[in-house]
């Protein structure tokens, strides 16, 4: 008795494919050892055809694969383009030799089935339309035409030229002739369902002089495409259902026993389990669309189906496309926080992992929006301007070689709560979803800047101080000047560093920055923050206005700008989102379902940046106290 299990007998026809699953006991050794598929010879020797070590025999080249699923304790052998020569005895097994643990499989490949003479075979997927061609002689040109379906010895009429239609084919079958053709009629059957499969006979005329044609209709459920994805990575279902359903509502659903539960559709329905991590993107006017799901979980594995129907729900007899998604738990994508919490007026530092082999890729951060299909406009990127409404409070810090970049958002408001995506223009699997939860602040922020009304005068010296609590004593403190392409670290002076950590005086922990002399280009947002190595922590922001000595009125009212830093009024947040919408064309990389689109967004952002203000940090120098 072998502990390996699989199908004992597999039968198919020439040209078809088989997918043979072998089950093995769930042990660590079994999960990692070699898997093989070999053909049993008359001499008792079993010749390897394919193995998990990468071996592929000549006769299987280009038509076979072996995939191990350690989390399911199975491996699958896929063999395509079968011929009768593939008939034989095989073994699927585990071990370094072909004598280890195995299971015997008999494969029989027969010829395509024989049908009565003149039988035309039609193979169609569920939901599609078949056009059956019926030839007749001139003598029957004016005779009754019909199509019937064989049921045992009887043949039940489906449709005829007297306008009779069998009720089960109502609104689905039509009989017609094309142009001036006098020797052929056609029957269209649309919205095909499995029970339509069978042998049909079309007939012109009656009695012995009647012309008859046989048609064998095979109605297939679409072969699911197998998708193998890593835990925490992303998957894109590309759905192309054809022009005939271009104007119908589209959906993606997940098979659950006999039902298929809709995950998302174009009518606004969305499964809460996919909130924040799904996008449906129309591709063109021919009904093509794609659905992207990020942050894959173990429970996302299963059978998916996309389809189209005016109700946005699965409907028998409408075209579908199918996938089987496997989620590999041995993932290369690191586990990162899926929920980040912040408080109003505070800040968050979000670490976004990316493929370390692609350190030069463009990095982005976008805000998932729950409109009907979901969308994710870019808020910031390594070569993308920060979206309006986020100036002075959002920056992306790339850390080449570390396999991660950090996005900092400060001056938080409750409207910042929601889902955000980290993504790059490189490996599309590395897309992570973060839920940001912003609660009302109940205490003073950890970092405080003085003076809060920061107006500097050109030519003079201006010092600004950032007060930090003792818990940040050992961390690196920094000041940076925010610009559209990041926040550039400035020289600064840590007043508290001279004290010993034992006698930390809460009131005198200060890091200050001095502008000497103040220049016009010093105007803008400045951040005070703490970090430990590459790990960024709390930040706070202040707007420094710069005015001429002679003039009394600053360029921007600093009180207004800094009021926003403390708590943005609702009107302003609403205005921001409107402006963000207007700006979307600049930076929204078509919802990232297509990698080229992200690249385009990057290119365009690069172009914008070249013509914009790079935010020079010149003219700032540290205090030399």
């Amino acid at each position: 008795q072998s502990p390996i299990f699989g199908p004992q007998d597999v039968s198919s026809i020439e040209g078809n494919s088989v997918s043979i699953t072998c089950y093995y006991p769930d042990t660590s050794v079994n999960r990692h050892t070699r898997k093989y598929w070999c053909r049993q010879g008359a001499n008792g020797y079993c010749a390897t055809l394919i193995s998990s070590n990468g071996y592929l025999s000549k006769e299987y080249s280009g038509r076979a694969s072996l995939i191990n699923f350690p989390e399911n304790s199975t491996f699958v052998i896929n063999i395509a383009h079968l011929t009768q020569e593939d008939t034989g005895s095989y073994k699927c097994g585990l071990g370094t030799t072909n004598r280890g643990l195995f299971f015997d499989v008999s494969l029989e490949v027969s010829q395509v089935p024989e049908f009565p003479n003149d039988t035309h075979v039609y193979t169609k997927d569920i939901g599609r339309t078949v056009t059956i061609e019926c030839r007749f002689k001139e003598g029957n040109a004016h005779s009754k035409k019909s199509l019937c379906k064989k049921r045992g010895e009887a043949c039940e009429v489906v449709i005829d030229s007297t306008e009779y239609v069998d009720p089960s084919y109502k609104d689905r079958a039509i009989l017609f002739m094309k142009g001036t053709s006098r020797d052929i009629f056609y029957v269209n059957i649309s919205h095909l369902i499995p029970s339509d499969a069978g042998l049909y006979v079309c007939q012109a005329g009656e009695g012995p002089s009647a012309d008859k044609n046989n048609a064998d209709l095979q109605v297939l459920e679409p072969e699911p495409e197998l998708l193998y994805k890593d835990l925490r990575s992303s998957v894109t279902f590309e759905c192309d259902l054809g022009r005939e359903v271009a104007n119908d509502a589209k959906y993606l659903c997940r098979k659950n026993k006999e039902t298929c539960d809709v995950i998302i559709n174009t009518l606004g329905k969305r499964d809460p389990a996919f909130e924040g991590r799904i996008l449906l993107t129309p591709r063109d006017d021919n009904g093509r669309f794609s659905v992207l799901i990020t942050g894959l979980r173990k429970e996302d594995a299963g059978h998916y189906q996309c389809g189209a129907h005016s109700s946005g729900l699965p409907q028998e007899g409408w075209p579908v496309q199918a996938w089987q998604l496997f989620v590999n738990e041995e993932s290369t994508i690191p586990n990162s926080r899926s929920v980040v919490k912040g408080v109003t007026g505070g800040s968050v530092a979000i670490v976004c992992p990316y493929n370390p082999k692609e350190s030069s890729s463009l990095k982005y951060w976008c805000h998932w929006e729950a409109d009907e299909n979901g969308r994710c406009p870019v808020l910031v990127g390594t070569q993308a301007l920060v979206q309006e409404g986020y100036e002075g409070r959002l920056a992306l810090f790339d850390q080449p070689g570390s396999g991660a970049y950090t996005v900092i958002l400060n001056q938080l408001t409750t409207q910042d709560s929601g889902f955000y995506w980290c993504l790059t223009d490189g490996d599309s699997r590395w897309r992570t979803t973060i839920e940001l939860q912003v609660a009302e602040a109940t205490k003073k922020p950890d970092l405080e800047v003085t003076p809060q009304n920061a107006t500097a005068v050109i030519g003079e010296t201006f010092t600004i101080s950032c007060h930090y609590p003792c818990k940040f004593y050992s961390q690196e403190k920094y000041w940076c000047k925010w610009s559209n392409d990041g926040c550039h670290i400035l020289p600064s002076h840590d007043e508290g560093a001279r004290q010993s950590s034992v006698s930390c005086d809460q009131s005198s922990q200060i890091v200050s920055m001095t502008l000497n002399p103040v220049k016009k280009e010093d105007e803008g947002w400045y951040w005070c923050g703490v970090k430990e190595g590459q790990v960024y922590g709390e930040t706070t922001a202040i707007y420094v206005a710069v005015e001429e000595r002679t003039r009394g009125s600053p360029h921007i009212n600093p009180t207004d700008a800094n009021a926003r830093a403390k708590d943005a009024p609702e009107e302003e947040a609403m205005e921001s989102s409107v402006r963000e919408d207007e700006n979307k064309a600049n930076l929204d990389p078509r919802l990232f379902a297509d990698e080229r689109e992200i690249q385009n967004a990057g290119d365009q952002a690069q172009e914008n940046r070249a013509s914009g203000n790079a935010g020079s940090a010149g003219g700032q120098s540290g205090s030399s106290k």
Partner: nanobody, 129 residues
């Protein structure tokens, strides 16, 4: 909804043969899986055989205890699955249940009862010595 009706059970002598049939009414399956399980008195229900299909491709699975003696087959047009049982032994005595799964894909391990969506009422097979 799919209903499964088993037939063909009865009393047979050891070494004899029986043919069980399971008819599925309702929707035609263009792909899916049907299987036979059995439950002997005082024992748990166990896997006997299964057949999966999609288009013209068929996969047949058997429990070690019935290999070479039982044969599972499917009649497409009638939506029925049969289990031909030869060389019957007294330990084959049990209630035999038919199970079905209607899916785009054959699914997981055919030996698992959770893999099936529909079940018949069962038919009793008694093998006397």
């Amino acid at each position: 909804q799919v209903q499964l009706v088993e037939s063909g059970g009865g009393l047979v002598q050891a070494g004899g043969s029986l043919r069980l049939s399971c008819a599925a009414s309702g929707r035609a399956f263009s792909s899916g899986r049907m299987g036979w399980f059995r439950q002997a008195p005082g024992k748990e229900r166990e896997f006997v055989a299964a057949i999966s299909w999609s288009g013209h491709t068929t996969y047949k699975y058997y429990a070690d205890s019935v290999k070479g003696r039982f044969t599972i087959s499917r009649e497409n047009a009638k939506n029925t699955v049969s289990l031909q049982m030869n060389s019957l032994k007294p330990e084959d005595t049990a209630v035999y249940y038919c199970a079905a799964r209607q899916s785009l894909v054959a699914g997981g391990d055919p030996r698992g009862q959770s893999e099936y969506d529909y079940w018949g009422q069962g038919t009793l097979v008694t093998v006397s010595s």
